[in-house]
Amino acid sequence: HTAAQDNCTCPTNKMTVCSPDGPGGRCQCRALGSGVAVDCSTLTSKCLLLKARMSAPKNARTLVRPNEHALVDNDGLYDPDCDPEGRFKARQCNQTSVCWCVNSVGVRRTDKGDLSLRCDELVRTHHILIDLRHRPTAGAFNHSDLDAELRRLFRERYRLHPKFVAAVHYEQPTIQIELRQNTSQKAAGDVDIGDAAYYFERDVKGESLFQGRGGLDLRVRGEPLQVERTLIYYLDEIPPKFSMKRLTGGGSGGGSHHHHHHHHHH
């Protein structure tokens, strides 16, 4: 696995321990918490990153209305079980034997149950809607410039193929970034939209996962863009299975309807 040879660090993941013990004395980096070897030339999977995090010390409406099956991550942090490839296992359980099913981005998609709960397959999140509100700026943002800059960011910083950035919507001060990636579209070596979205989410919270980089400096024609709040909606290839109790207001977070629970990152 490639890493910076000179000082043996992982450019794409600061939550690693690196040493020159790879083949031929090459630098090899392992994720904290799991010890899994990671490829430092690309993004680390969200599952391994969450595990590492838990192991560390503690007018015309142009905006998208999230689908009724959209999920928002209200459960917060947990210590996930990852498969050997670093993907989330379909079933997650806590220390008290409470279990639930998750999608490919690790967000719960069923009611919580006990150890008898079955999660037949890891359901893929194929559509992610990142909803941002930027803070007021001295200079206005031009939609096409903003679109180009956000596409550049996902391509260059997160190494996400441009075809997976489906759209960028802007209705001041709200920006929406739509990421779409079906199972059939994702080729070997492609960054997963869930991982790109997670890196972006951490960046806009001022918690960059990249090694040795300062905070993300995002500019549109030189004008800095500052994010005041972030909401991320996840849509799965198969709709989630929640009880009617949750659908009629039993869920947490005070959202307006269904699973649109506002999860404020700032």
Epitope: P136, G215, G222, V227
Partner: antibody
Framework: QVQLVQSGAEVKKPGASVKVSCKAS????????INWVRQRPGQGLEWMGW????????KYNEKFKGRVTMTVDTSTSTVYMELSSLRSEDTAVYYC???????????????WGQGTLVTVSS | EIVLTQSPATLSLSPGERATLSCSAS?????IYWYQRKPGQAPRLLIY???NLASGIPARFSGSGSGTDFTLTISSLEPEDFAVYYC?????????FGQGTKVEIK
């Protein structure tokens, strides 16, 4: 540490132009914009504009539009501010200052260059 | 153009006293920045985003306010704090500064 070093004092005749340089060090030059602010004798601070070295974007104070030109030389990490058609009221100390910003916050103008005194006199 | 009016123009105090400097904006702004300028020196950033202390600035400096009224407070004046203080807005172009408040030794 982050440092901005400006060129020395200048004396100019009315109608002439002056070009002040600001050399940056101690940070990734292309990641922050450089602002120019002046202070006339006995007056307050007056913002002139900024330039963003990564793509050359700039924003000028309308008051100086047509007279001010900001340029950048990334090979030497230097920003230039040229003011033309000088008049006596342009006599001032001219400062460059870095504005650091991330998606989280705008961290203000920090640090500032030591200032360049430009005297316009016939 | 947003006009920032600082008051008082001059504040005469003794070391150890509390200094309260005001900055009033002609229209609502989201954040205010405060700078200190000593004779013969370049300005120095004290406070960014209204209330956040810049790197290396002592904790006796604090900022507060919202909308059109903002305050810089120095809890207990040290001899090196006697200087001119400027507020600045980044809400709309042109960026503007207040005319300054001079804090002098009484």
């Amino acid at each position: 540490q982050v440092q901005l070093v400006q060129s020395g004092a200048e004396v100019k005749k009315p109608g002439a132009s002056v070009k002040v340089s600001c050399k940056a060090s101690g940070y990734t030059f292309t990641s922050s914009d450089i602002n120019w602010v002046r202070q006339r004798p006995g007056q307050g601070l007056e913002w002139m504009g900024w330039i963003y070295p990564r793509d050359g974007s700039k924003k000028y104070n309308e008051k100086f539009k047509g007279r001010v030109t900001m340029t950048v030389d990334t090979s030497t990490s230097t920003v230039y501010m040229e003011l033309s058609s000088l008049r006596s009221e342009d006599t001032a100390v001219y400062y460059c200052a870095r504005r650091f910003a991330t998606v989280v916050s705008n961290y203000g103008l920090d640090p500032w260059g030591q200032g360049t005194l430009v005297t316009v006199s016939s | 153009e947003i006009v920032l009016t600082q008051s008082p123009a001059t504040l005469s105090l003794s070391p150890g006293e509390r200094a309260t400097l005001s900055c009033s904006a002609s229209s609502s702004v989201n954040y205010i920045y405060w700078y200190q300028r000593k004779p013969g020196q370049a300005p120095r950033l004290l406070i960014y985003d209204t209330s956040n202390l810049a790197s290396g600035i002592p904790a006796r400096f604090s900022g507060s306010g919202s909308g059109t009224d903002f305050t810089l407070t120095i809890s207990s004046l040290e001899p090196e704090d006697f200087a001119v203080y400027y507020c600045q807005q980044w809400n709309s172009y042109p960026l503007t500064f207040g005319q300054g408040t001079k804090v002098e030794i009484k």
